[in-house]
Interface confidence: medium
């Protein structure tokens, strides 16, 4: 069991400068730790690649909305 106090913090130091079509994204998580230099969103793609993105960008906000809706309406 990892020690919560000393758990490593994942930070983003650079953001992708290219959009990723929403259908290539599987999930996301927000990075808001004060230990990180900037707030970020980490997208996980359908091939399990992790990509840092800028939460201020419209495509990032659109993508998070899309993924949130996918969770709310599971496929039959």
């Amino acid at each position: 069991q990892p020690d919560a106090i000393n758990a490593p913090v994942t930070c983003c130091y650079n953001f992708t400068n290219r959009k990723i079509s929403v259908q290539r994204l599987a999930s996301y998580r927000r990075i808001t730790s004060s230990k990180c230099p900037k707030e970020a969103v980490i997208f996980k793609t359908i091939v399990a690649k992790e990509i840092c993105a800028d939460p201020k960008q419209k495509w990032v906000q659109d993508s998070m909305d899309h993924l949130d809706k996918q969770i709310q309406t599971p496929k039959p």
Epitope: K19, S21, V22, K58, W59
Partner: antibody, heavy 122, light 107 residues
């Protein structure tokens, strides 16, 4: 360099059918979405239909004005986009452009063909 | 679909700044794209993602988008900029919505 060349336009009677083609070259065709956009004489641009890229299993979408009458398709082995137009009406008269896009849903068109004219008249 | 409204025409003297507006509900929350179309030619993308220029497009073309209005600005307008200009945005499922177009006349 990217090239899109439309063909198949012409004069057709109301109720008739026509199939447009768009031959693509200079890019990896299957990785891009493709659309048809039309422009009636002296009027503005109107999006007609899109077929997405390999990442979305080539999903299709249509404008309400053509849904049920037009069918978009693609042959990735031939780098060609198609638009099958049935039950044509006078208001379908327009120059039809094919155009490519990369990302969904942020669809914008970075390259366009020169267009092919479809005239629906008796 | 998002409805985009443009003025039918805008006139500008050579060397002056032309501004073409495009309005729509909460447009600032979406990306806006601009195309130039000269008579008998296919449209050409001049601005993407609100304010980015594709390679080969002169620096005098710029874009902005906030609130309900996006604006295409052409600084130091030249005679060759005379054309129709269309704004475009998107909805879900790869559908695209175009404005009605603005005819730019360079006096």
């Amino acid at each position: 360099q990217v090239q899109l060349v439309e063909s198949g336009g012409g004069l057709v009677q109301p109720g008739g059918s026509l199939r447009l083609s768009c031959a693509a070259s200079g890019f990896t065709f299957r990785s891009y979405g493709m659309s048809w956009v039309r422009q009636a004489p002296g009027k503005g641009l109107e999006w007609v239909s899109s077929i997405e890229h390999k990442w979305t299993n080539y999903a299709t979408s249509y404008a309400a004005s053509v849904k049920g009458r037009f069918t978009i398709s693609r042959d990735n082995s031939k780098n060609t986009l198609y638009l099958q137009m049935n039950s044509l009406r006078a208001e379908d008269t327009a120059v039809y452009y094919c155009a490519r896009f990369e990302f969904t849903p942020w669809t914008y068109f970075d390259f366009w063909g020169q267009g092919t004219l479809v005239t629906v008249s008796s | 679909d998002i409805e985009l409204t443009q003025p039918p025409s805008v006139s500008v003297a050579p060397g002056q700044t032309a501004r073409i507006s495009c309005s729509g509900d909460n447009l600032g929350k979406k990306y806006v794209y601009w195309y130039q179309q000269k008579p008998g030619q296919a449209p050409v993308l001049v601005i993407y993602d609100d304010d980015n220029r594709p390679s080969g497009i002169p620096e005098r073309f710029s874009g902005s988008n906030s609130g309900n209005t996006a604006t295409l600005t052409i600084s130091g307008t030249q005679a060759e900029d005379e054309a129709d200009y269309y704004c475009q945005s998107y909805t879900a499922q790869s559908s695209a919505s175009f404005g009605g177009g603005t005819k730019l006349t360079v006096l």
